[in-house]
């Protein structure tokens, strides 16, 4: 029977800068029941606080709701593991909410084959930003990436769309059924999951771009 091993805070994420969650990995339990607590203080403070919500984020997590989340202050946090034989602490972790944003996937993905008479046909892809993200404040710049492939193909073709919410693709294989997905990333944060796939049938008379 031993004191617990050193825990590690290995992930913090925020969907929108208004709330966030951090997760830790327990060290060895020393063969005894072990209690974990996350404590934190904010920059410029010495007063330590305990995690406000151990439930919402699931096991070994701490969730900071709206009233506990500030974009203006860095959080300095650590996890304490305690059993009957002693305690151990994780390394301190500095968390700036701006740098942990991982948005939900973009919404309303629409895909359409356009065949103008005077120009080459193309695939037109359009989407909307995730609802939780407020782009009007200027705090967020969202970048988008599209991936598509014929239904039976193994490899995805990836296109970076920058900040635009629509995109044209010219080079496609006629007669194939394509899967299309989109994801987004704030300029300082993490890529979202890919949106659910949208399927589109490319007509057989679709002319490949040279």
């Amino acid at each position: 029977q031993l004191p617990p091993g050193k825990p590690e805070i290995f992930k913090c994420r925020s969907p929108n800068k208004e709330t966030f969650t951090c997760w830790w990995r327990p060290g060895t339990d020393g063969g005894l029941p072990t209690n974990y607590s996350l404590t934190y203080h904010r920059e410029g403070e010495t007063l330590m606080h305990e995690c406000p919500d151990y439930i919402t984020g699931g096991p070994n997590s701490c969730h900071f709701g709206k009233q506990y989340t500030s974009m203006w202050r860095t959080y300095i946090m650590m996890v304490n593991a305690t059993n009957q034989m002693g305690s151990s602490f994780s390394d301190e972790l500095y968390v700036d909410v701006t740098y942990i944003v991982q948005p939900d996937p973009p919404l309303e993905l629409a895909v359409e084959v356009k065949q103008p008479e005077d120009r080459k046909p193309y695939l037109w892809i359009k989407w909307s930003p995730p609802t939780l993200i407020d782009l009007k404040t200027g705090w967020f710049t969202l970048l988008y990436e599209i991936r598509l492939k014929p239904e039976k193909a193994a490899e995805w073709e990836i296109h970076f769309a920058g900040q635009q919410t629509e995109f044209k693709i010219l080079s496609l294989h006629p007669g194939q059924k394509y899967l299309v997905q989109v994801r987004c990333k704030p300029d300082h944060g993490y890529w979202s999951a890919w949106s659910p796939a949208t399927f589109i049938q490319i007509p057989s008379d679709f002319t490949m771009n040279d």
Epitope: E8, F10, K11, C12, K17, R25, E43, G44, M71, W72, T74, D91, L93, Y94, V95, D96, T98, Y99, I100, G138, W139, K185, H188, Y190, W191
Partner: antibody, heavy 118, light 112 residues
């Protein structure tokens, strides 16, 4: 404890490439972005770029765009910085550096001296 | 790119005496999120740089309270209230509000 251990010193010819490695330990490698910073002899520090090892997203200083490539190998918890078309002005100590969930550098490698000389 | 200008280039200080280093940026360093990402690093002889102060005025963990940072907009200052022998090295200011992140040219602090 967090450690960043870099590869050894290199001597390279002008026009060639160099690849410096940075092996991370003491934390989950894919959890934090890894930056590269260089320091020419007797000079200041210069940020080169960054990688998110969880999905290999990179962002480079435009000054090095096209010459620098930052990669990461999750299986060995190692980040790499490759600089091509070397010139004498690239003679410098190259550092890998990790932040927390922040935009300052909390941990630094010991540095790798790259000398470019004919 | 944001240019960070440090003054003086070097400082020779008697132990126990104060020291002050100035850093001026070519543009305001207020991020769109309201934070000012101006930091100070110390590079001791033969070592890698180490973080002293983050976001203008916050001492990093383990940094003695004789170090303090202040400033806003484009003008920032690092002060050492009583210089000790272990404080020798080159001090760098750094901004990470705008990409590419940039550093000042450094201020070398020596003991008299």
């Amino acid at each position: 404890q967090v450690q960043l251990v870099q590869s050894g010193a290199e001597v390279k010819k002008p026009g060639s490439s160099v690849k410096v490695s940075c092996k991370a330990s003491g934390y989950t490698f894919t959890s934090f972005w890894m930056h590269w910073v260089r320091q020419a002899p007797g000079q200041g520090l210069e940020w080169m770029g960054v990688i998110d090892p969880s999905d290999t997203y990179t962002n480079y200083n435009q000054k090095f765009k096209g010459r620098v490539t930052i990669t990461a190998d999750e299986s060995t918890s190692t980040a790499y910085m490759e600089l091509s078309s070397l010139r004498s002005e690239d003679t410098a100590v190259y550092y890998c550096a990790r932040g927390d969930y922040s935009n300052w550098f909390t941990y630094w490698g010991q540095g790798t001296l790259v000398t470019v000389s004919s | 790119d944001i240019v960070m200008t440090q003054t003086p280039l070097s400082l020779s200080v008697t132990p126990g005496q104060p020291a002050s280093i100035s850093c001026r940026s070519s543009q305001r360093l207020v991020h769109s999120n309201g934070n000012t990402y101006l930091h100070w690093y110390l590079q001791k002889p033969g070592q890698s740089p180490q973080l002293l102060i983050y976001k203008v005025s916050n001492r990093f963990s383990g940094v003695p309270d004789r170090f303090s940072g202040s400033g806003s907009g484009t003008d920032f200052t690092l002060k050492i209230s009583r210089v000790e022998a272990e404080d020798v090295g080159v001090y760098y200011c750094s901004q990470s509000t705008h990409v590419p992140w940039t550093f000042g040219g450094g201020t070398k602090v020596e003991i008299k």
